[in-house]
Each structure stands twice: as C-alpha cells, then as structure tokens.
Amino acid sequence: GSMAHSDGIFKKEQAMCLEKIQRANELMGFNDSSPGCPGMWDNITCWKPAHVGEMVLVSCPELFRIFNPDQDMGVVSRNCTEDGWSEPFPHYFDACGFDEYESET
C-alpha cells in the first residue's frame, strides 16, 4: 500500500540525508564545536549545515509528490540562529499536507 511505499521512501531519504550531511560537513569544515547549525534529518526532510544568520529552504519531501503529483512543490524554511535551528516555517502540515512520518506499525 501507499504507507509501505512511503516507509521505503523515508528510509532511503534518511540514509541519503546522513550521507549528504557528512559530505557537507567535510566541504564546509564543520565539526561538533563549529558555530552554526549542524545538518539534520528531522524525520521529514534533510537540512544541510548552515552558518548563523543563514536561511535554508527545502522543498516538501518526495512523499508529497506521491500524494500530489500535479501540484507545485511546497517550500519550508528554517533560520540558523545562535541558539540553533528555528522551527520550520511555514509548518510542514500547512506547506506539505503532513507533519510527521507515519509508519504502518
């Protein structure tokens, strides 16, 4: 079913995200003590590492495309602040139609 399909997509996206973050950390010279915001997988989509003051934009994840193949992709942003990542804006639920990954189990 679509849930099983989405389960596979999310596991794949998560694995790809962790690889992307590792590569980005190497390229940007980021480590655990670096100022800024570390890359993260927030259980919905991937956020690349960012410097303080930077705003990062991401498209709604692939699951959105399954449910809405003919629609424009929504966009969500986070700001990297001195206190870390801001909350996503707009909220995933409003921009993408869902706000957390649900598995069948």
Epitope: Q71, D72, H91, D94, A95, G97, E100, E102
Partner: antibody, heavy 123, light 107 residues
Framework: QVQLQQSGPGLVKPSQTLSLTCAIS??????????WNWIRQSPSRGLEWLGR?????????HYAVSVKSRITINPDTSKSQFSLQLNSVTPEDTAVYYC?????????????WGQGTLVTVSS | DIQMTQSPSSLSASVGDRITITCRAS??????LNWYQQKPGKAPKLLIY???ILQSGIPSRFSGSGSGTDFTLTINSLQPEDFATYFC?????????FGPGTKVDIK
C-alpha cells in the same frame, strides 16, 4: 456524499460554555486524509477560523491564537462526530458557527460545511 | 496574522458580464489560497483551491489566478445563480484568515 449536521443550543449566557456538535456522514472523524474544523461568522469579525482536530495515528489539534485559551475541539470516534467547546463566552462570541471538513490537494481547503448554528450570547 | 483584503467590497453586474474580484495578502502566501461563494443564510461553498484549481462540480466559467500576494477570481458570463458574496482565504499560516468578502449583486 459527505454531510455534516450541527446541533447545540442557540442561546448561551455570558461567562458560560458554548457547546456544539458536528455529526459526520459519508466520512469518518478518524480519516487519515481529513481535518475537522470549526469556523464562525459575525458581522463585526467576518469569517473566522477557530481550530481543527485530525487523526494521523494520534489525535492532534490546532487552534487560532485568538481563542486558544478558551477552546477545545474533541473527536468522538464512537459516533463519528466532533465537538466545539468555547469557555467564558462574551457577547462578542455571538456568531453563526460552522463545522467543516478540511482536505488537502496542494493546500488545505474546506470542501464540506455544516448548515451553521446561530449562537447568541446574552443574559 | 496575515491580513486579507478584497476589492471591490461590492459590485453590480448584469447576467452575461465578465467580472474580476481581487484578493491581496499582507505577506506572500505563495499559491495557498482558496475562494468560496456564500449565499444568504447558507454556508460558504468551495469554488477554487491552491489559487487556481477548480473544485469538482464547479462550472468552468469560474477561474482563479495569482501567486504571492495578489490573486484574482474571474467569473466569465455571469449567471443568475452567481449573485452572491465571494471570500478568499489564505491556507498557509494559522490562523487561516478570510477576506472581508465581495458582494456581487444585480445591476
């Protein structure tokens, strides 16, 4: 065919609790695709979205900040209905109250509405 | 809150006319905008969602366009049943605010 049928008193005294129910037919309050919303309309405030409940493996609620401290929206899965409770009402809460189903296709929209209930807050 | 404004607030038109109603958001809402029609004593009825997509069962004389802050609802060849009040609604930031409405009446 989705239908929403509202029920509840049309007159509430100031400081008391406004309670309305919306019975769903043709869909389920536990649907993983829908949200279940309350909206009100008055001449002074126009159409005002109040809040919603929805099920995605667990129940969630979103409320408008303007009423967040006073509002509760509860699903009743046994009767496939949902309710609105608005506490500490004042005459400013006098309005026509609507329930509506929210659906997603590129954005959230309200595609089926209840018939509306005029609620007057007066002593 | 995002403020939604509509213009005109009312308009008089004749059957067969083409009319345009404008909705403006106080900040960008991309294409997260809905249009509703309401007749006296009735609940609002969904016409268009996501800025431009016609709801199932709505006649093709209704169309929506726009993105960002400026949106339009167009009714081609106005029919007697189209005399009503029209509302826009932004659907991206809680609270999901509505415009004040545009009343379309018979000239």
């Amino acid at each position: 065919q989705v239908q929403l049928q509202q029920s509840g008193p049309g007159l509430v005294k100031p400081s008391q609790t406004l309670s309305l129910t919306c019975a769903i037919s043709g869909d389920s309050v536990s649907s993983r695709q829908a949200t279940w919303n309350w909206i009100r309309q008055s001449p002074s405030r126009g159409l005002e979205w109040l809040g919603r409940t929805y099920y995605r493996g667990k129940w969630k609620n979103h409320y408008a900040v303007s009423v967040k401290s006073r509002i509760t929206i509860n699903p009743d899965t046994s009767k496939s209905q949902f309710s609105l409770q608005l506490n500490s009402v004042t005459p400013e809460d006098t309005a026509v109250y609507y329930c509506a189903r929210g659906m997603w296709q590129g954005n959230w929209f309200l595609d089926h509405w209840g018939q509306g209930t005029l609620v007057t807050v007066s002593s | 809150d995002i403020q939604m404004t509509q213009s005109p607030s009312s308009l008089s038109a004749s059957v067969g006319d083409r009319i345009t109603i404008t909705c403006r958001a106080s900040q960008s809402i991309s294409r997260y905008l809905n249009w509703y029609q309401q007749k006296p004593g009735k609940a609002p009825k969904l016409l268009i969602y996501a800025g431009r997509i016609l709801q199932s069962g709505i006649p093709s004389r209704f169309s929506g366009s726009g993105s960002g802050t400026d949106f339009t609802l167009t009714i081609n060849s106005l029919q007697p049943e189209d005399f009503a009040t029209y509302f826009c609604q932004q659907a991206i930031i809680n609270p999901y605010t509505f415009g004040p409405g545009t009343k379309v009446d018979i000239k």
